[in-house]
């Protein structure tokens, strides 16, 4: 048969941030194409990315149906131009992915500080509630909608004139912190899911400093 040149996919890897989820694999195809299937542990296989020469497949639409489920994918290899051909066992070569549970494993995307406002010796810092591709009732849910109180934010804040970073935490998207009067402060936030054992923290948000246009100062 024409399968002698067909090689199985390998290094199947899930790449997922805020539930945008792509399966990647190797090798770059030479005279072959791939089809991906995905299923939950108890569900039926669903085919995606039919006969593609890509080495990645966006599976977001499937995993967002239930982000707490555990998914398995497999990548089938077919000879180019002869996709009906099968392997010696009577079916095309395929390789299984590792299991993937989006709720536990999707990386937390870099957060953004939406605004900060100083009132006297207090500063209110607000974190943008990022939209995900998870839907409920035809509406896209925010990160907070999906994770609820499992998601916290850590705020790093420091005087512009010093390097030591103080921290504060919140399970909402707002911080209210005490600052010294007449001092300018800088801020950065990190998303954290403490209940996880891996992928617990996002990268830090871009640093925002007082005296820049995102903030507002009110003397009271």
């Amino acid at each position: 048969s024409g399968t002698t040149n067909t090689v199985a996919a390998y290094n199947l890897t899930w790449k997922s941030t805020n539930f945008k989820t792509i399966l990647e694999w190797e090798p770059k195809p030479v005279n072959q194409v791939y089809t991906v299937q995905i299923s939950t542990k108890s569900g039926d296989w669903k085919s995606k990315c039919f006969y593609t020469t890509d080495t990645e497949c966006d599976l977001t639409d499937e995993i967002v149906k239930d982000v707490k489920q555990t998914y398995l994918a497999r990548v089938f290899s077919y000879p180019a131009g002869n996709v009906e051909s099968t392997g010696s066992a009577g079916e095309p070569l395929y390789e299984n992915s590792p299991e993937f549970t989006p709720y536990l494993e999707t990386n937390l995307g870099q957060p953004t500080i939406q605004s900060f406002e100083q009132v006297g010796t207090k500063v209110n810092v607000t974190v943008e509630d990022e939209r995900t591709l998870v839907r409920r009732n035809n509406t896209f849910l925010s990160l907070r909608d999906v994770f609820g109180k499992d998601l916290i934010y850590t705020l790093y804040y420091w005087k512009s004139s010093s390097s030591g970073k103080k921290t504060a935490k919140t399970n909402t998207n707002e911080f209210l912190i005490d600052v010294d009067k007449g001092e300018n402060y800088c801020f950065s936030v990190q998303a954290v899911i403490p209940s996880r054992t891996v992928n617990r923290k996002s990268t830090d948000s871009p640093v925002e400093c007082m005296g820049q246009e995102k903030g507002e100062f009110r003397e009271i």
Epitope: I152, Y156, A168, Q190, S195
Partner: antibody, heavy 120, light 107 residues
Framework: EVQLVESGGGLVQPGGSLRLSCAAS????????IHWVRQAPGKGLEWVGY????????YYADSVKGRFTISADTSKNTAYLQMNSLRAEDTAVYYC?????????????WGQGTLVTVSS | DIQMTQSPSSLSASVGDRVTITCRAS??????VAWYQQKPGKAPKLLIY???FLYSGVPSRFSGSRSGTDFTLTISSLQPEDFATYYC?????????FGQGTKVEIK
């Protein structure tokens, strides 16, 4: 199993330097925060400083600011406490501890400690 | 910095006694208070987190409570292995701060 093991303590003269290590196993330090806490003989617990190993950001107690530096090597899963300009009052058992990082739980695992004696 | 004032600094009690240790924060720390037990030559061990929650593996005779900025650790019936030093700690703001400790000794 989560474990923290400190090493590098010993006898040092006033004005001298010492580097303590905190080797972590059972978890990845960049997913957490690492604190150093010390305890002078017969005294209570005193917080020294922390590091977020993911970004290298730190904060120190006033008593050690400018003399002590906390760093981390994520490839070795190890945090360090570099102590310079040591004084007699820095004599203590030094502990590293993992910060769980939630609103509710802070220092959930501690190392066994390493003794630093500053004396001429 | 927030001060945590712990009392008493030491107490003598007998096995079976009910023991209460208190900590007062110099300002609001919400429920971000932990209690640790330390035995001589050993590292502190977490007993209570978030003011009133028992940490995994800690016997149920230990309990914690909060009233405003006052925090209490109670041992309902003191056991021989409970003779140790106890510390409160706030982690509401940086720097985190500890109470001075309470040594529980055998009467």
């Amino acid at each position: 199993e989560v474990q923290l093991v400190e090493s590098g303590g010993g006898l040092v003269q006033p004005g001298g330097s010492l580097r303590l290590s905190c080797a972590a196993s059972g978890f990845t330090i960049s997913d957490y925060w690492i604190h150093w806490v010390r305890q002078a003989p017969g005294k209570g617990l005193e917080w020294v400083g922390y590091i977020d190993p993911q970004n290298g950001w730190t904060y120190y107690a006033d008593s050690v600011k400018g003399r002590f530096t906390i760093s981390a090597d994520t490839s070795k899963n190890t945090a360090y406490l570099q102590m310079n300009s040591l004084r007699a009052e820095d004599t203590a058992v030094y502990y590293c501890a993992r910060d769980y990082g939630s609103l509710e739980v802070s220092l959930d695992y501690w190392g066994q400690g390493t003794l630093v004696t500053v004396s001429s | 910095d927030i001060q945590m004032t712990q009392s008493p600094s030491s107490l003598s009690a007998s096995v079976g006694d009910r023991v209460t240790i208190t900590c007062r924060a110099s300002q609001d720390v919400n429920t971000a208070v932990a209690w640790y037990q330390q035995k001589p030559g050993k590292a502190p061990k977490l007993l209570i987190y978030s003011a009133s929650f028992l940490y995994s593996g800690v016997p149920s005779r230990f309990s914690g409570s909060r009233s405003g900025t006052d925090f209490t650790l109670t041992i309902s019936s003191l056991q021989p292995e409970d003779f140790a030093t106890y510390y409160c700690q706030q982690h509401y703001t940086t720097p985190p701060t500890f109470g001075q400790g309470t040594k529980v000794e055998i009467k």
